[in-house]
Every structure is written in structure tokens, then in C-alpha cells.
């Protein structure tokens, strides 16, 4: 239900997409049981959610990954929710870290990030991980979204 | 505060309930510091939250469990947020996985799931876990809820 | 964007602050990319978010910590979201628990808590942890917030 033409609902929920790219930025798709309320929020280049209206947004991401301590770098697996506003540098909004499992061949773990942030028109949010090859893309495991308050 | 008779607030937060049932669907109760905004959302059979109005909802669940790698199956502990819409098959909205701990007798871990989804009138959401006997029911550890945008 | 003078948006997101205090209550600051929508929600004594209006709020916290099983007590690391309403005892709203890692010197883990609760005017929410010295205060790792529905 719309709040009215002047104040429509703005929300998105996108689903992880496996990628052959070596970038640490996760890829997303409008597939499965996704949400894209209207064109006031868009998924750009499969990697970032971009908003057209200024305001407060609750932004969240969930990342499930599978890793093993011996086969990974000593550093933990870190997922970061990042912001790119027009004419500004990228900045980290939220991060979560999980030490790799000792389970073999790998141990699955899930990370959830979420918080309320002010976004400017044209601002984009995206998710970075330390090793995208470890991310789980099975149904429901890894997703990303936002809602405007 | 109500948004108005045409657009009342709709929200719920229910508390986990230990169950002797062998089903993988978690049981919930309106007890402790629970929330049930009005009759536009109801807890049915102690297992599912059912909504009367179509719209976008932020749905979440938190599950704390205690398990041990040696005493559990090789598969990780998985919590799933599932949707049953009238006249449709059940579907998974969100999942999270955590490998069992090596701590003895068991190691506690917490999982959080949350996302924005479109629900139809009469739609129900529920939470499935791989082993309900491992779920922690102490105050605040395991809960389930939603809010309508 | 305000919903109107009678129903302004109320939201906060505050950032963890390392503290020399031995208290188990985490300390927060309005620093970095924080949110404080207006004076209807305030951060008091750097430790609690206090609201002026009654209503339903989605309240969340994220805590990242680094611990080692051998160097910690046998009990898991527990993060608790707590409520103090005027003239009432404190109560636990949400808790999450994670067993300490076997990684050395310590293994990082992240906990996320979130739920919908009715708050009274003057109610305060705060976050307790079993060992504040283990909490990670790097950018984005530990935060706390709420939004009024």
C-alpha cells in the first residue's frame, strides 16, 4: 500500500549472485522472492542499491560463507556495508567479522548487518567481503536490502 | 501511535516456546515482553505469524542454539524463514547456517535473519530449524517478528 | 523527510566507544556516520538511548568481539539488549550468545540483535555484554540503534 504520491514506500531486497569477477564487491540480482518497490530505488550494475530520495533508511545485509582456518588467510572473514554518496569518498557504515571454522572441508557461518542511516539523493550502498569465493549462494543464504523510514 | 484507521501500525514480536513436538517448525508464544499490535497480525497454532493485509513487511527471526560437532550430524545448524501464501507452495525466504561448535558439552551460537518481503492477505511466515532440540529458550535468546512498512 | 509535525521520524544509530569503566554496559557516541533524528530520542550518559514518545520501536544492536576459549571464562560471550522504563525494573529484551573461538590470540565474531518493542515515554534501552574488554571498536564493528514505526 502506498503512503501517498508524495511519500511512496521505498524498499528493496535482492538476492546474491555467484560471479566469476575477482572483485570483493558482492553481486546481486532481482530474482527469486526479491523486492523492488518502485524506481526510487534501483539495483545498479548488479552491485549497488541506489536511492533517488534523501532520507533515513534501514539498510541490511546477510552473508553466509563457508571457510576453513587452514585454507584461508589468518585474517577473519569480514563483510562490510559501504556507502558511496555523490562527490564523496566511499565509507564503511557497518562491518562484521567471523573467524574461520576448523571444520573440514569448510564450516558455514552467517553474518547479519543492519542499521539506520541518512542517505542523499543518488547515494549507493554495496557489500564488500574479504573473499567472495567463500560466499554461499544457496536459496536464502545471502541477501541485501533497505527500506525508507 | 496509529497512523490512522486506514493505515494502522502492524507489528508482532513473539517469544520462543520449548515444544515436545518433533517437528522442525519452531513454536512461539505471546508471553514475556511480546508485541501484537492488533488483529491484523496473529500468531496461529503457536507456529506462524499470519497477516490480513497485503503489503511490504520487514520480517525477522533470531535463533540461539547450543550444539557440539561430535554429537551432531555433519550438516550445519540451519535456520530458515519460510513463507506460506494461500494457494501456493511453501518457500524459503531467508536461511542462515552455523557449523557446530567443538565446545563441550555444547557451544552456544546465535543466528539473526531479516528482510523485506511482499506478503499477500492470509500469508503466513514461520521458522524452521534443522534440530529444534538444540534451540535455547532462555529469556531473549530466540524470537520472531515482523513490522509492516 | 518528516512525516509531519505530529508524527516526526524518530531514529538513532550510535557508534561504540571504548571505555575504561569496568561496567558491563557498553558505551556509545554520536560520532562517525551516526544518526540522531531529533530530540525525541537522545543518547544519555553515553550508555542508553532514551525516547520521549510512546510507541512501537524496532531496536537493534550489533556487537563484534574477539575472544579465545582458553583465555576466557567457560561461559559464552553474551550480548543483551535491555529496557529500563520509568518506575519499573530493568528487563532483558533480547540476548545472543557465542561460544569463544579456539583461534589465537583471539577469534572475532559478530552478534546481531533486533526486535519490535513497545516503549513508554522516558524509556531507555541499553546493551550489556559479559566482557566489554573483548568488544571490537574498529569502524562499523559495533553499533546500536532504533527507529519508531
Amino acid at each position: 500500500m502506498q503512503k501517498g504520491d508524495q511519500n511512496p514506500q521505498i524498499a528493496a531486497h535482492v538476492i546474491s549472485e555467484a560471479s566469476s569477477k575477482t572483485t570483493s564487491v558482492l553481486q546481486w540480482a532481482e530474482k527469486g522472492y526479491y523486492t523492488m518497490s518502485n524506481n526510487l530505488v534501483t539495483l545498479e550494475n548488479g552491485k549497488q542499491l541506489t536511492v533517488k530520495r534523501q532520507g533515513l533508511y534501514y539498510i541490511y545485509a546477510q552473508v553466509t560463507f563457508c571457510s576453513n582456518r587452514e585454507a584461508s588467510s589468518q585474517a577473519p572473514f569480514i563483510a562490510s556495508l559501504c556507502l558511496k554518496s555523490p562527490g564523496r569518498f566511499e565509507r564503511i557504515l557497518l562491518r562484521a567479522a567471523n573467524t574461520h571454522s576448523s571444520a573440514k572441508p569448510c564450516g558455514q557461518q552467517s553474518i547479519h548487518l543492519g542499521g539506520v542511516f541518512e542517505l542523499q539523493p543518488g547515494a549507493s550502498v554495496f557489500v564488500n567481503v574479504t573473499d567472495p569465493s567463500q560466499v554461499s549462494h544457496g536459496t536464502g543464504f545471502t541477501s541485501f536490502g533497505l527500506l525508507k523510514l | 501511535m496509529q497512523k490512522g484507521d486506514q493505515n494502522p501500525q502492524i507489528a508482532a514480536h513473539v517469544i520462543s516456546e520449548a515444544s515436545s513436538k518433533t517437528t522442525s517448525v519452531l513454536q512461539w508464544a505471546e508471553k514475556g515482553y511480546y508485541t501484537m499490535s492488533n488483529n491484523l497480525v496473529t500468531l496461529e497454532n503457536g507456529k506462524q505469524l499470519t497477516v490480513k493485509r497485503q503489503g511490504l513487511y520487514y520480517i525477522y527471526a533470531q535463533v540461539t542454539f547450543c550444539s557440539n560437532r561430535e554429537a551432531s550430524s555433519q550438516a550445519p545448524f540451519i535456520a530458515s524463514l519460510c513463507l506460506k501464501s494461500p494457494g501456493r507452495f511453501e518457500r524459503i525466504l531467508l536461511r542462515a547456517a552455523n557449523t557446530h561448535s567443538s565446545a563441550k558439552p555444547c557451544g552456544q551460537q546465535s543466528i539473526h535473519l531479516g528482510g523485506v518481503f511482499e506478503l499477500q492477505p492470509g500469508a503466513s511466515v514461520f521458522v524452521n530449524v534443522t534440530d529444534p532440540s538444540q534451540v535455547s529458550h532462555g529469556t531473549g535468546f530466540t524470537s520472531f517478528g515482523l513490522l509492516k512498512l | 523527510m518528516q512525516k509531519g509535525d505530529q508524527n516526526p521520524q524518530i531514529a538513532a544509530h550510535v557508534i561504540s566507544e571504548a571505555s575504561s569503566k569496568t561496567t558491563s554496559v557498553l558505551q556509545w557516541a554520536e560520532k562517525g556516520y551516526y544518526t540522531m533524528s531529533n530530540n525525541l530520542v537522545t543518547l544519555e550518559n553515553g550508555k542508553q538511548l532514551t525516547v520521549k514518545r510512546q510507541g512501537l520501536y524496532y531496536i537493534y544492536a550489533q556487537v563484534t568481539f574477539c575472544s579465545n576459549r582458553e583465555a576466557s571464562s567457560q561461559a559464552p560471550f553474551i550480548a543483551s539488549l535491555c529496557l529500563k522504563s520509568p518506575g519499573r525494573f530493568e528487563r532483558i529484551l533480547l540476548r545472543a550468545a557465542n561460544t569463544h573461538s579456539s583461534a589465537k590470540p583471539c577469534g572475532q565474531q559478530s552478534i546481531h540483535l533486533g526486535g519490535v518493542f513497545e516503549l513508554q515515554p522516558g524509556a531507555s534501552v541499553f546493551v550489556n555484554v559479559t566482557d566489554p574488554s573483548q568488544v571490537s571498536h574498529g569502524t562499523g564493528f559495533t553499533s546500536f540503534g532504533l527507529l519508531k514505526l
Partner: nanobody, 118 residues
Framework: EVQLVESGGGLVQPGGSLRLSCAAS????????MGWFRQAPGKEREFVAE???????LYADSVKGRFTISADNSKNTAYLQMNSLKPEDTAVYYC????????????WGQGTLVTVSS
Amino acid sequence: EVQLVESGGGLVQPGGSLRLSCAASGRTFSPYIMGWFRQAPGKEREFVAEIGWRDTTLYADSVKGRFTISADNSKNTAYLQMNSLKPEDTAVYYCAARRGGDYLPTDWGQGTLVTVSS
């Protein structure tokens, strides 16, 4: 899906060596982690070794220092060199392929029997 065909199994004396091969066809080899599992009579299937596409290797504690996993991406083939074999290594050895985020393989070979006996 990936089709996996193992070869190289057989009978060997304790202390001897064998080299298992696994030829992969179908979907691209590179996004998968190739590994070996084994199942001894009356026991559960267990992890033996795997190799990632950055040539990171991982071994079960019971085979460390004795077994070596390798891969030839140009031939879409993975190998398991088994040295200092023991009677307790007797099992059916399965080649497997998993995506990085999955805790268990999605694709399995038919298996090849390795018997260590004097």
C-alpha cells in the same frame, strides 16, 4: 553439473603408493573446489583432501604428510598422490566438486576402491 570420473584405485601393500586421478567434464572446472572423500566399509564418508582454484590445499589430519592433492587445470583433472599407505586407508575414494560457499560437494564421482593389504 560436473561429471567426475575417478581412476587409479587398486590393491597395494602397506607402505606402498598409489596415484588417483579425477577427470572433470561439463561445467567449467575453475569455479569449483576439487576434493577427495573416502568411505570405509561400515563407516561414514569422510573428507580426505581438497584443492582450491588458487591452489590452496587442505588435508584431513589422518593423511597429512602422506597424501598430496594437485590439479592440472588445463586437463580439468585432479590428482591424489597417496604414499605410506596403511591398512586403515582402505576405502572407496570419491572425487568431488563443491562451490566455495557450500559445505558439502554438489557433484560426486562413482568412486574407486583402494585396498591396502599384505
